[in-house]
């Protein structure tokens, strides 16, 4: 059966939006008129994964390429790339942990914590046009929480 | 090797919690998920709930409103407790461990324990 | 939820009978479908997990197939020790549903 997927635009709490920055890296930066059409669009799979009451697992692709979000080990730390992936392949259910998010919905916000990494999250900074990350805070300096945007 | 041994009183009251323990070996709780399956005298099986190694948990609808799964990793157990039993409640309780394999066969359950009978009656 | 029917509830055969059983699901599962037994007074066995893979240590006479909606466990030829319950099980989300069980008797 073919996984499950929507498409999706995310804008953290700041109302940033997610932008390409390079082929294998997303920044955060507000966008207003003409420019919102620079956001990156979400293929958001439904996968398998540690599934609970109030966490979904779940792959973010994006759309119409070949590049999933993924969370690996670098120099000891746990970081967020974009990782290519074999589109004959990809998405799929049963997903690599690498590439599993637990959305969880928490006020009407959205986090996006790693499967691989438990409690490091999809993260912005307060700053203009930094590059998307994963942190290991919530409620701190740096941004966890999300809206999502449905995309026809 | 794998075992998990459940645990608890025999008899509970209606209206009072049920309240079991899984003591396992062989594997390590913070790596591998255990669900709770219960079974009716003379009838089938039905899925409770289970808790992954994360600790976070996924309970039935049925049951969700009385039921709390946790555990203990340094003690090897997990605990069932579920609310305002009645007669309805009265079954084997199983508990079972998860297969856990990441992008292959995640949410089977491969082994199991020998069962603890709970009747409810006053 | 997934709905499982699992049929025939009941079957009566004899040692070196080829026993059938299915397993149907209300949605595609694609090989997530596993086959337990379950013996008077005991706990279930994993036989088969993804359709069709014996478990470490599960006689040959026992098999498994189907994908999608559409599931079989075949005994190839049934030995004394085989007459007990069988259930199958959907493992590709939660929560997680069970056949109704079918029991296997001695004619």
């Known amino acids: 059966a073919p996984v499950r997927s929507l498409h999706c635009t995310l804008r953290d709490a700041q109302l940033k939006s997610l932008v390409m920055s390079g082929p294998y890296e997303l920044k955060a930066l507000h966008l207003q008129g003409q420019d919102l059409e620079q956001q990156v669009v979400f293929s958001m799979s439904f996968v398998q994964g540690e599934e609970s009451n109030d966490k979904i697992p779940v792959a973010l692709g994006l759309k119409a390429k070949n590049l999933y979000l993924s969370c690996v080990l670098k120099d000891d730390k746990p970081t967020l790339q974009l990782e290519s992936v074999d589109p004959k392949n990809y998405p799929k259910k049963k997903m690599e942990k690498r590439f599993v998010f637990n959305k969880i919905e928490i006020n009407n916000k959205l986090e996006f914590e790693s499967a691989q990494f438990p409690n490091w999250y999809i993260s912005t900074s307060q700053a203009e046009s930094m590059p998307v990350f994963l942190g290991g805070t919530r409620g701190g300096q740096d941004i966890t929480d999300f809206t999502m945007q449905f995309v026809s | 090797e794998v075992q998990l041994q459940e645990s608890g009183p025999g008899l509970v009251k209606p209206s009072e919690t049920l309240s079991l323990t899984c003591t396992v070996s062989g594997f390590s709780l913070s790596d591998y998920g255990v669900s709770w399956i219960r079974q009716p005298p003379g009838k089938g099986l039905e899925w409770i709930g289970l808790?992954?190694?994360?600790?976070?948990?996924y309970y039935n609808s049925p049951l969700k409103s009385r039921l709390t799964i946790s555990k203990d990793n340094s003690k090897s157990q997990v605990s069932l407790k579920l609310s305002s039993v009645t007669a309805a409640d009265t079954a084997v309780y199983y508990c079972?461990?998860?297969?856990?394999?990441?992008?292959?066969?995640?949410?089977?359950?491969?082994?199991w324990g020998q069962g603890t009978l709970v009747t409810v009656s006053s | 939820d997934i709905q499982m029917t699992q049929s025939p509830s009941s079957l009566s055969a004899s040692v070196g009978d080829r026993v059938t059983i299915t397993c149907q699901t209300s949605?595609?599962?694609?090989?997530?479908l596993n086959w337990y037994q379950q013996k008077p007074g005991k706990a279930p066995k994993l036989l088969i997990s993804l359709a069709s893979t014996l478990r470490p240590g599960v006689p040959s006479r026992f098999s498994g197939s189907g994908s999608g909606t559409d599931f079989t466990f075949t005994i190839s030829s049934l030995q004394p020790e085989d007459f007990a319950t069988y259930y199958c099980l959907q493992s590709d989300r939660l929560p997680l549903t069970f056949g109704q069980g079918t029991k296997l008797e001695i004619k």
């Open positions: 808790i992954w190694g994360s600790g976070d948990t």
């Open positions: 949605t595609d599962i694609d090989d997530d």
């Open positions: 079972a461990k998860q297969t856990n394999i990441w992008a292959y066969d995640l949410y089977s359950m491969d082994y």
